[in-house]
């Protein structure tokens, strides 16, 4: 922590300007009034402060705003944002997308994924929902950031906004997030024709249940293996060999290349070997002919 000293009269600060770069840490602490700093935050980013000096300025703002900075200050943080921790950001209330854009630009190229995730979370809370303007801002300035939101936050996305989401925006989404987004996407694209629907729904299919995957297999969609591999394991396992063949179309030969990877490996283990043989791909590991499969979990549930 910066030690307290009194400010020499000749060092008194009346405005935030370039002369401050020559101040030592303790002089900044003693001579810069926190309220003045807050009022003139828009000047700070133009001044080449050292990281040590920025620490002092942050300390002053923290003292002035122990409950969290107001948006008028947050909007002009500039490189001072790089000093913020997720705990600091959690105290903020942010509603302006201009503020979000400004801070996303600053964070680019820095290891700040936790801070950015918290910032986006605060914006969604501040605005009440994940509206189209917010999604547009995220896709433009922070591809992939949508997936930093919790499933709970993502549940506030109205289906009408889903069309603004691009495949690359979902690249880092986990299964729980796709579980939330998929039903919204299904609703958003429900009036589209078969092929157009598949193109749109494809990035969301990691959240699709078995019955929807089975339905797709009846529509000649020719799903590529990359999409198939992103399907939930639980959605893939009940599919029959015939359904998978119809679902993948000409891409079915890719099963051979991916046979060691889940969910393909797990699916193979659940199929009868003679059914797998009909694909002509040399897939091995299916249930041998003549074997009976007893689902012991059912028996355990009954006992």
């Amino acid at each position: 922590d910066v030690e307290r000293t009194t400010c020499p009269p000749e060092k008194e600060v009346h405005e935030i300007d370039e002369s401050l770069i020559f101040y030592k840490k303790r002089e900044l602490e003693a001579c810069v009034d926190a309220a003045l700093l807050a009022a003139q935050m828009d000047r700070v980013d133009a001044i080449p402060f050292t990281y040590e000096q920025l620490d002092v300025l942050k300390h002053k703002l923290d003292e002035l705003y122990p409950q969290g900075y107001p948006e008028s200050v947050i909007r002009h943080l500039g490189h001072l944002f790089l000093k913020m921790s997720p705990e600091d950001i959690r105290k903020w209330n942010v509603t302006s997308l201009e503020t979000l854009k400004a801070l996303l630009k600053v964070s680019k190229g820095h290891e700040m994924s936790a801070q950015v995730a918290t910032l986006i979370d605060r914006v969604v809370v501040g605005r009440g929902q994940l509206d189209k303007d917010t999604v547009d801002t995220l896709t433009a300035f922070c591809p992939g950031c949508l997936c930093s939101l919790s499933p709970e936050r993502l549940s506030s996305v109205p289906p009408s906004v889903i069309g603004a989401v691009r495949p690359q925006d979902l690249d880092t989404c986990g299964p729980r997030q796709l579980d939330v987004l998929y039903p919204k996407a299904r609703l958003a694209f429900q009036n589209m024709s078969g092929s157009e629907y598949f193109v749109k729904i494809r990035p969301f299919l990691g959240g699709a249940p078995t019955e929807d995957v089975k339905a797709l297999s009846q529509q000649n969609v020719s799903m590529d293996l990359a999409t198939f591999m992103k399907l939930r394991r639980e959605a893939v396992l009940p599919l029959t060999v015939a359904e998978v063949q119809k679902l993948l179309g000409p891409h079915v030969e890719g099963l051979k290349v991916e046979e060691q990877h889940s969910p393909v490996r797990d699916w193979i283990l659940k199929q009868r070997q003679d059914d797998l043989d009909t694909l002509g791909l040399g897939l091995q590991g299916g249930i041998p002919n003549g074997y009976l499969i007893l689902d012991l979990s059912v028996r355990e549930a009954l006992s």
Epitope: A226, F228, K230
Partner: antibody, heavy 119, light 108 residues
Framework: EVQLVQSGAEVKKPGASVKVSCKAS????????MDWVRQAPGQGLEWMGD????????IYNQKFSGRVTMTEDKSASTVYMELSSLRSEDTAVYYC????????????WGQGTTVTVSS | EIVLTQSPATLSLSPGERATLSCSAS???????LSWYQQKPGSSPRLLIY???NLASGIPARFSGSGSGTDYTLTISSLEPEDFAVYYC?????????FGGGTKVEIK
């Protein structure tokens, strides 16, 4: 432009471990597996294994089982290959190469990382 | 594992000549699962041909591939100065994936 950029050359002692990174850009990271292939000085190419960045699932060439670990960081579009218990015969150039899921050919390669194992 | 044997190990030819490179597999390879790569000294390999006969993006038409079962061929119809390099065949029909030992095409 599609690019795979690998980390710099490494010099290691026998018994140590090395971790090589491969940062991808210019394409949908999770639509392609990342494979690792090595090439000893004056020798041919040897496939080590692959990772599916979407699921984190890995397949390793049995020759390297127990010594190689492949991981991914989706948020950074980066994959890593760690080789442990290094010996002099592990001296090689290590390449990452992307492979469209469902195909087996490598259409884009990293620039290679030279790993030298010497006491 | 499937062993791929390439022959000849070295091919000495002049620019303008036809080059025929062979790749023989120890057991049958599904033809969809064989590719060819070119590598120049100090550079990474580059995909030339995939699925036995499909030309990769940006590869000139003088390169062609053929074959089935255990025998595969890469042909360069008329050698250009930039074609002198090492060529590798590669199979992913059977695990683990393997490469041939390479054929070096050098200037005569």
């Amino acid at each position: 432009e599609v690019q795979l950029v690998q980390s710099g050359a490494e010099v290691k002692k026998p018994g140590a471990s090395v971790k090589v990174s491969c940062k991808a850009s210019g394409y949908t990271f999770t639509d392609y597996n990342m494979d690792w292939v090595r090439q000893a000085p004056g020798q041919g190419l040897e496939w080590m294994g692959d990772i599916n960045p979407s699921t984190g699932g890995t397949i390793y060439n049995q020759k390297f089982s127990g010594r190689v670990t492949m991981t991914e960081d989706k948020s950074a579009s980066t994959v890593y290959m760690e080789l442990s218990s290094l010996r002099s015969e592990d001296t090689a150039v290590y390449y990452c190469a992307r492979r469209r899921i469902g195909t087996g050919y490598f259409d884009v390669w990293g620039q290679g990382t030279t790993v030298t194992v010497s006491s | 594992e499937i062993v791929l044997t390439q022959s000849p190990a070295t091919l000495s030819l002049s620019p303008g000549e036809r080059a025929t490179l062979s790749c023989s597999a120890s057991s049958s390879v599904i033809s969809s699962y064989l590719s060819w790569y070119q590598q120049k000294p100090g550079s990474s390999p580059r995909l030339l041909i995939y699925r036995t006969s499909n030309l990769a993006s940006g590869i000139p038409a003088r390169f062609s591939g053929s074959g089935s079962g255990t025998d595969y061929t890469l042909t360069i119809s008329s050698l250009e100065p930039e074609d002198f390099a090492v060529y590798y065949c590669h199979q992913w029909s059977s695990f683990p994936y393997t490469f041939g030992g390479g054929t070096k095409v050098e200037i005569k």
